[in-house]
């Protein structure tokens, strides 16, 4: 008799794929544009990335460091009107993209939460949650919560408001902290909170260190849903050298939880390559004309247009990973088991019941390595086969779809492999 199928877990929309942050509308759209109407015109691009949610803004009125002139219910006219916002919401809905609104109050000022009048600001946030929920947004983000006194209790209250409206609504909190204990204390009192942090931001050194960080986090958070990013707002290139971007894309898309990216991560957007551009929000490179300041500074392979035409580009990898992440049960909600694969490597299996299983092997080092996969580390339910098919490599040159012998697996410097193999009873 065939074994009984495992019951599928309840899945919220943010469990099904990546979130895409557009913190600066002007930088994202470029060419002196930067409003909600213009963003609506970019929704097809977001659809092509297969992202499930757009984290937008802040876009509310905020006079720098002035509580009285900060109105979370009013859209800054520079970004558009409520009608423009409503139109964006309707269009996003038609494309199955959820809209998450960033309500970080003093986003133009020194302290995101103002240094005084905490209760006044917290009440403003409560009002804004209620107003925008009724206006149709799918969730909220608040950043820099390390600057918010009594953050845990406020987050619990805001979470109650958000979930009280509908269980299908999301609250994201962001912190600059990379300290696991601080992160856990924020998560403790907030069951369904999605937290973005700088926890993984110093993981670029070795595979062992990354493995240790990831497994520690997953063990500490138990069976709660996580999010994966390198920071609450910044680009991957702020933390990673170019050669590790593909590896990290593969990792973020295949860890158990919601991957969260910033606009430009999909093309390796790097402020350092664009003189005069702010580190936190460089202009998005749609094509070679997006950065006219210095002629010739932008080559085609740095842009969305150029990378869209190249199947081997970072953008193409992002699209493929995003597609896999959103349709494979083992990646959507599968169990996770990390195991030893040798120094410099981080490897893990994702599996769900009798569905196709995935093996991820990541070489963080700058030398080629043979993987010594220690299958003995794995539980019986997640045993490794002798061979697995190569779904994709982060490096060119491998024949996709070909079976690889796992005992003889060799990885190039900074290479990541995504392999698939069937369930075997």
């Amino acid at each position: 008799r065939a074994p009984r199928c495992r019951e599928l877990p309840a899945q919220k929309w943010w469990h099904t794929g990546a979130l895409y942050r557009i913190g600066d509308l002007q930088a994202f759209q470029g060419h002196g544009a930067g409003n909600l109407a213009g963003l609506k015109g970019r929704l097809d691009y977001l659809s092509s990335l297969k992202v499930k949610g757009l984290v937008l803004g802040p876009i509310h009125k905020n006079q720098k460091d002035d509580v009285a002139q900060t109105d979370l219910l009013q859209i800054d006219p520079n970004f558009g009107s409520k009608e423009d916002f409503d139109s964006l919401l309707q269009s996003a809905k038609k494309k199955s993209i959820r809209v998450i609104l960033d309500l970080t109050p003093n986003y133009r000022g020194e302290n995101s939460w103002f240094s005084t009048q905490v209760d006044t600001v917290a009440t403003k946030v409560k009002d804004a949650l209620e107003f925008w929920l009724q206006a149709g947004v799918d969730g909220f983000q608040v950043r820099d919560i390390e600057n918010l006194k009594d953050a845990s209790s406020f987050l619990a209250e805001w979470q109650n408001i958000t979930k009280g409206f509908s269980e299908d609504r999301l609250l994201i909190a962001g912190t600059n902290s990379s300290d696991l204990q601080q992160i856990l204390s924020l998560l403790e009192s907030n069951k369904d909170l999605l937290l973005t942090s700088s926890y993984l931001s110093d993981s670029g050194s070795t595979g062992e260190h990354t493995k240790s960080l990831v497994t520690q986090y997953l063990n500490a958070t138990g069976n709660r849903w996580c999010s994966w990013s390198l920071s609450q707002a910044r680009l991957l290139t702020s933390f990673l050298p170019a050669q590790l971007l593909r590896l990290y894309q593969l990792m973020l898309f295949t860890l158990p939880g919601t991957p969260v990216f910033s606009y430009g991560d999909e093309i390796g957007l790097d402020a350092a390559a664009l003189p005069g551009q702010p580190m936190e929000a460089p202009v998005m490179l749609w094509d070679e004309s997006s950065f006219p300041d210095i002629p010739g500074a932008v080559s085609a392979n740095m842009t969305v247009k150029g990378q869209s035409e190249d199947p081997g580009s970072l953008l193409s990898l992002f699209r493929r990973l995003s597609d896999q992440r959103s349709k494979e049960r083992s990646l959507l909600h599968g169990d996770f088991h990390a195991f030893s694969a040798g120094p410099g490597l981080f490897s893990y299996i994702r599996h769900w019941d009798q569905n196709e299983r995935f093996l991820v092997v990541l070489n963080f080092g700058d030398v080629g390595l043979s993987a010594g996969l220690q299958a003995s580390d794995l539980p019986a339910s997640a045993s490794l086969p002798a061979k697995a098919d190569l779904l994709l490599s982060t490096q060119p040159g491998r024949e996709e779809g070909s079976p690889l012998e796992l005992e003889r697996l060799k990885l190039e410097p900074h290479e990541g492999l995504l392999l698939r193999f069937p369930y075997a009873a």
Partner: antibody
Framework: QVQLQESGPGLVKPSETLSLTCTVS????????VHWIRQPPGKGLEWLGL???????NYNSALMSRVTISKDTSKNQVSLKLSSVTAADTAVYYC?????????????WGQGTLVTVSS | DIVMTQSPDSLAVSLGERATINCKSS????????????LTWYQQKPGQPPKLLIY???TRESGVPDRFTGSGSGTEFTLTISSLQAEDVAVYYC??????????FGQGTKVEIK
């Protein structure tokens, strides 16, 4: 118990500014929003604006350039100002509490105050 | 702005009989986010302020007699008084409280005893 009481001059000259105060008791203005509504004699209700617990304000766009709502939490008072009034602004003016989360319904109303615009 | 239209303008019903008031909105008042319909009913007796009867189209405010029932969804709504009492003589208003302001009222329906 929850109470709201409107007060202000009953007669205002055309082109002047109408100023009304709503004094509340039995609840805190830092926990609840307050709406202003008006009703011309023998006619229906018109929503003017809402001041939220945190101080944000939604106005009726038809009157937006003329209406100002503010509050003094320490005095438990909300005020309404309507500038450049004409005879068409003659009405009973009500303040009412926004009483429910995820709803703009008004669960408690003041008795209303009649304002006549006439020279 | 959402336009609210009530019918009839006035209604005469015998004591103990059913009174039915209709309200139509120019766009749907259903919020797909929480599946609630953002329509409110008020009762205004002569010389008094309005009184909240029903919100979310069908949720009765506490203390409101159960002879008052709200129904409908999308753009068409009904307030039913199952057995009219003398104290129910009043003008009844529907109000949209959906999404963005202004939160507009219907023109009112006057209920009298036949």
């Amino acid at each position: 118990q929850v109470q709201l009481q409107e007060s202000g001059p009953g007669l205002v000259k055309p082109s002047e500014t109408l100023s009304l105060t709503c004094t509340v008791s039995g609840f805190s203005l830092t926990s609840y929003g307050v709406h202003w509504i008006r009703q011309p004699p023998g006619k229906g209700l018109e929503w003017l604006g809402l001041i939220w617990a945190g101080g944000s304000i939604n106005y009726n766009s038809a009157l937006m350039s003329r209406v100002t709502i503010s509050k003094d939490t320490s005095k438990n008072q909300v005020s309404l100002k309507l500038s450049s009034v004409t005879a068409a602004d003659t009405a009973v003016y009500y303040c009412a509490r926004k009483g429910h989360m995820y709803s703009y319904a008004m669960d408690y109303w003041g008795q209303g105050t009649l304002v006549t615009v006439s020279s | 702005d959402i336009v609210m239209t009530q019918s009839p303008d006035s209604l005469a019903v015998s004591l103990g009989e059913r009174a039915t008031i209709n309200c139509k909105s120019s766009q749907s008042l259903l919020n797909s986010g929480n599946q609630k319909t953002y329509l409110t009913w008020y009762q205004q007796k002569p010389g008094q302020p309005p009184k909240l009867l029903i919100y979310w189209a069908s949720t009765r405010e506490s203390g409101v007699p159960d002879r008052f029932t709200g129904s409908g969804s999308g753009t068409e709504f009904t307030l039913t008084i199952s057995s009219l009492q003398a104290e129910d003589v009043a003008v009844y208003y529907c109000q949209n409280d959906y999404s963005y302001p202004p939160w507009t009222f219907g023109q009112g329906t006057k209920v009298e005893i036949k």
